[in-house]
């Protein structure tokens, strides 16, 4: 049987991705993060 | 508020075709997502679903009936207009239209329904 | 077509104890979107059908919290919680996944 007709079950949000590095000083190395919506998930 | 009636004969003979208004109010044919279909129950029995259009156009029938029957629509008059070609005894049923909108922020499903005509076929 | 099959086709329930309606489709009803279209309508005497239950388990506005779907594939239920008098008539499954959209036999519950 053909389907029936119904939106795709997803909704597409755009954010903006920043990826940054902190240098954190000469023994610590560098800190890498994710940050999404303004928010650091990484 | 949101509704819908249906209006036709009340008995046609057999061979003849029958055409069907379902004039709605509370929404709009031209909204995105929006559609209208129709469904039938004859005495005692139950439901069938018979067509569906949406606001785009589309259309969708149900195959086992699909060569008798046209569904269109005219926005302008919120109305939607089934006709059913070649009626026999066993077309005799209560005749119902109802509302379905796509969308995930949508019910997607028969929300609202007319309160049905009731069609005899007979000669 | 979606074989939709109903039972009990006859439901005597005493006010205030649960009942249950089971449907079962005979395939999948999945929609390749990942939402199951299967919908529950309750027909009381003499009226139009109206909504009670749409994707399996989502009540509509106005309906009683004491209805709810549930299940998954091909096996579904309805239950009431504590049946009312005013619950009387048929309930219809149905699924609108595929062409054509399609219904039970309906279950008629009655207050004993």
């Known amino acids: 049987d053909a389907e029936f007709r119904h939106d795709s079950g997803y909704e597409v949000h755009h954010q903006k991705l920043v990826f940054f590095a902190e240098d954190v000083g000469s023994n610590k190395g560098a800190i890498i993060g994710l940050m999404v919506g303004g928010v650091v998930i990484a | 508020q949101v509704t819908l009636k249906e209006s036709g004969p009340a008995l046609v003979k057999p061979t003849q075709t029958l055409t069907l208004t379902c004039t709605f109010s509370?929404?709009?044919?031209?909204?995105?997502?929006?559609?209208v279909g129709w469904i039938r129950q004859p005495p005692g029995k139950a439901l069938e679903w018979l067509a569906h259009?949406?606001?785009?156009?589309?259309?969708s029938y149900n195959p086992s009936l699909k060569s008798r029957l046209t569904i269109s629509k005219d926005t302008s008059k919120n109305q939607v207009v089934l006709t059913m070609t070649n009626m026999d005894p066993v077309d005799t049923a209560t005749y119902y239209c109802?509302?379905?909108?796509?969308?995930?922020?949508?019910?997607?499903?028969?929300?609202?329904w007319g309160q049905g005509t009731t069609v005899t076929v007979s000669s | 077509d979606v074989v939709m099959t109903q039972s009990p086709l006859s439901l005597p329930v005493t006010p205030g104890e649960p009942a249950s309606i089971s449907c079962r489709s005979s395939?999948?009803?999945?929609?390749?979107?990942?939402?199951?279209?299967l919908e529950w309508y309750l027909q009381k005497p003499g009226q139009s059908p109206q909504l009670l239950i749409y994707?399996?388990?989502n009540r509509f506005s106005g309906v009683p919290d004491r209805f709810s779907g549930s299940g998954s594939g091909t096996d579904f239920t309805l239950k009431i919680s504590r049946v009312e008098a005013e619950d009387v008539g048929v309930y219809y499954c149905?699924?609108?996944?595929?062409?054509?959209?399609?219904f039970g036999q309906g279950t008629k519950l009655e207050i004993k």
């Open positions: 149905s699924q609108a996944s595929r062409v054509p959209l399609t």
């Open positions: 395939q999948s009803i999945l929609h390749s979107n990942g939402n199951t279209y």
């Open positions: 994707k399996v388990s």
């Open positions: 109802a509302r379905r909108q796509l969308g995930l922020r949508s019910i997607d499903a028969m929300d609202y």
């Open positions: 509370g929404f709009s044919l031209s909204t995105s997502g929006m559609g």
């Open positions: 259009i949406w606001w785009d156009d589309d259309k």
